[in-house]
């Protein structure tokens, strides 16, 4: 065997956040040489399931007819070809909603806010919870907050927004969860419409600060370094300057790459140029273009090795929520606090989209824009204008990871750097 087999792609349809009782299909896509596909679930020593490949042998289907707590968790898949087992896929996090009663979402002082002023979204649960999550509907890239408070149980979490701009306007929902299983979420709250009025326009919303829960004076919002949080205005400018610097650097790099690309292009075919253009810098060979997750090698996207990119699409808000989540939490300190730090980054889209593992029919009927989501996972530039993406950095996810015996190709292989990818779709 010349080298390790490429890792397969793992995804869930209709998404990876599923309401209790609903069906979900997990797909694992490998190569045409695959003879068997295996799905492993974290904490499960035996292979969770195995299936023959479906013709033309490049993928397998694992069906869950009715979502329950037992199915929520972290999955990886492998395939076996004549030369052995593949590398593991990137993890798929299957999340179940409906595990707890829905929280209440409100806006303080009011859901009607003047541009430039401050507003705080308050997510309250009837029973004490330690994790709260906020999503925004009808936004390509919403703010997403996740916070665990020292294991302490809280009845509410605050999501401050300052200064508010027109971009903050829209419909929000929140979820609550217990820290012992981040794969089990409450029912979604009723939607809250945030209406922004006034003429003070800001071209881009400021990153929302770390979530704090109402718990007394010692309960300060955590920053990555443990430093005291800056004032909203100072932090706003710091982030804007940071974004500007990063944008300039990226633009310089892009111009350099384009120049180099143009100079080399005279001696290449169009196909070769496109293949090169889509290859992440430093990569020896292209990642499989099968709609899978690719490692981000962009400095703008890699924030201390752990990313959380969130994207929301809306179809029918009244039907519940589905969220496509892929995440590799660190296993450093199970007692550590999970918090969110939001950063702005501007990944550009690639010119040629990879083949989608989702059927055309699914894309049409569900309006998931799956191609667009996957294209965001690349570094290649496109002619269109860059689009803002909010990255939230999650540190020391409070999940213990139990090692399971890997297939033979895994011996001596160093695990890939953890990455997080989430796509939220409201259903």
């Amino acid at each position: 065997q010349a080298g390790p087999l490429p890792k397969p792609t793992l995804w869930a349809e209709p998404g990876s956040v599923i309401s209790w009782g609903n069906s979900v299909t997990i797909w694992c896509q490998g190569t045409l040489e695959a003879r068997e596909y295996r799905l492993d679930k974290e904490e499960s020593p035996a292979p969770w399931d195995r299936q023959n490949p479906l013709e033309p042998k490049n993928k397998a289907r694992f069906s869950i007819p009715s979502m329950t707590e037992d199915y929520a968790g972290r999955y990886r898949c492998y395939y076996r070809s004549p030369v052995g087992w593949s590398q593991p896929s990137d993890p798929l996090e299957l999340v179940m909603t409906g595990a707890y009663s829905k929280p209440t979402l409100s806006a303080l002082p009011s859901p009607l806010v003047t541009s430039g002023k401050s507003v705080t979204l308050l997510c309250q649960s009837r029973s004490p919870m330690d994790t709260f999550l906020l999503i925004k509907e009808r936004a390509a890239h919403p703010l997403l907050h996740l916070r665990s408070e020292h294991g302490a149980q809280q009845h509410q979490a605050e999501f401050p927004m300052s200064p508010v701009t027109s971009v903050h306007g829209g419909t929000y929902r929140c979820f609550s969860s217990h820290g012992f299983s981040h794969y089990l979420l409450s029912h979604p709250s009723d939607p809250l419409e945030l209406i922004v009025s006034g003429s003070l326009e800001d071209p881009r919303p400021s990153p929302t600060r770390s979530v704090s829960t109402a718990a007394g004076p010692e309960d300060q919002p955590l920053m990555p370094t443990g430093s005291v949080p800056h004032s909203g205005l100072r932090r706003h400018w710091e982030v804007l300057i940071g974004v500007l610097v990063v944008s300039i650097l990226l633009l310089s790099l892009l111009l350099f790459l384009l120049l180099q690309h143009w100079r080399q292009g005279k001696h290449r075919t169009l196909a070769q140029r496109q293949a090169d253009f889509q290859r992440p810098p430093g990569a020896a060979e292209p990642e499989p273009k099968d709609g899978g997750l690719q490692r981000r090698s962009s400095p703008a996207a890699d924030v201390q090795g752990e990313n959380f990119c969130a994207a929301v699409k809306n179809t029918q808000p009244e039907d519940g929520v589905e969220m496509d989540t892929r995440q590799s939490p660190h296993d450093e300190d199970p007692q550590a606090v999970t918090y969110a730090k939001v950063k702005h980054s501007r990944p550009r889209r690639e010119m040629a989209s990879p083949p989608s593992p989702l059927s055309g029919e699914f894309l049409d009927t569900k309006d998931r824009q799956a191609e667009e989501d996957r294209q965001m996972d690349t570094e290649a530039a496109a002619s269109e204008a860059p689009q803002d993406v909010t990255y939230a950095q999650l540190h020391s996810f409070t999940l213990r990871q139990k090692a399971t015996e890997p297939p033979p190709s895994q011996e001596g292989a160093s695990p890939a750097e953890p990455s997080v990818y989430a796509t939220l779709a409201i259903h």
């Epitope: 003879r35 068997e36 679930k41 499960s44 020593p45 035996a46 292979p47 969770w48 399931d49 195995r50 299936q51 023959n52 037992d70 004549p82 030369v83 052995g84 087992w85 015996e405 890997p406 297939p407 033979p408 190709s409 895994q410 011996e411």
Partner: antibody, heavy 124, light 107 residues
Framework: QVQLQESGAELVKPGASVKLSCKAS????????MHWVKQRPGQGLEWIGE????????NYNEKFKTKATLTVDKSSSTAYMQLSSLTSEDSAVYYC?????????????????WGQGTSVTVSS | DIVMTQSPSSLSASLGDRVTISCRAS??????LNWYQQKPDGTVKLLIY???RLHSGVPSRFSGSGSGTDYSLTISNLEQEDIATYFC?????????FGGGTKLEIK
């Protein structure tokens, strides 16, 4: 040591159903899949299906999809196979067998331990 | 399904003999071949997995070889306790399938 204790011989009438059991001991029941294999008198072995005791996931041989139903009871570390609408073709010895990874970090899987077999005779 | 053809269906040999049993698959099974021994009382044991790997507790006189579609089991020094029926089984694709068996007797 690993042991798979199967239930006793069964004499059943055509059209009836029978439920065979296989009690596992000497290992962690949920760490290994359980397979079921059929052997007709003087003939070879036929794979019926498999079940993952930890989550109840099953895979069946197409030939036995409507014939056999595999279940487990984790609390008693017991696997079950129900055979329905029995005919004389179902008269056979049925084995349960443990399937799992062999060798440390090798990634090779096989049925490594078998029960003693349960004889099922279908006769009116 | 992959068809496994075993030969011979039966054979007689003397104690101390070297015995070889063959197994052919209807398609390439990439070395995912196991050998089982079934004693006259019905007890079944795994002997060899993945073509040539000896299962724990199996005497070293048993060995396996092969690749692609052709595989074999060899008993280098036949002993009385080896009297049994031997089955090959492919584990390359679901469903697993078995050969028809080779019944080994003492002359």
């Amino acid at each position: 040591q690993v042991q798979l204790q199967e239930s006793g011989a069964e004499l059943v009438k055509p059209g009836a159903s029978v439920k065979l059991s296989c009690k596992a001991s000497g290992y962690t029941f949920t760490n290994y899949w359980m397979h079921w294999v059929k052997q007709r008198p003087g003939q070879g072995l036929e794979w019926i299906g498999e079940i993952n005791p930890s989550n109840g996931r099953t895979n069946y041989n197409e030939k036995f999809k409507t014939k056999a139903t595999l279940t487990v009871d984790k609390s008693s570390s017991t696997a079950y196979m129900q055979l329905s609408s029995l005919t004389s073709e179902d008269s056979a010895v049925y084995y349960c067998a443990r399937w799992g990874q062999l060798g440390l970090r090798e990634g090779y899987y096989a049925v490594d331990y078998w029960g003693q077999g349960t004889s099922v005779t279908v006769s009116s | 399904d992959i068809v496994m053809t075993q030969s011979p269906s039966s054979l007689s040999a003397s104690l101390g003999d070297r015995v070889t049993i063959s197994c052919r698959a209807s398609q390439d099974i990439s070395n995912y071949l196991n050998w089982y021994q079934q004693k006259p009382d019905g007890t079944v044991k795994l002997l060899i997995y993945y073509t040539s790997r000896l299962h724990s507790g199996v005497p070293s006189r048993f060995s396996g070889s092969g690749s692609g579609t052709d595989y074999s089991l060899t008993i280098s020094n036949l002993e009385q306790e080896d009297i049994a029926t031997y089955f090959c089984q492919q584990g390359n694709t679901l469903p697993p399938t078995f050969g028809g068996g080779t019944k080994l007797e003492i002359k």
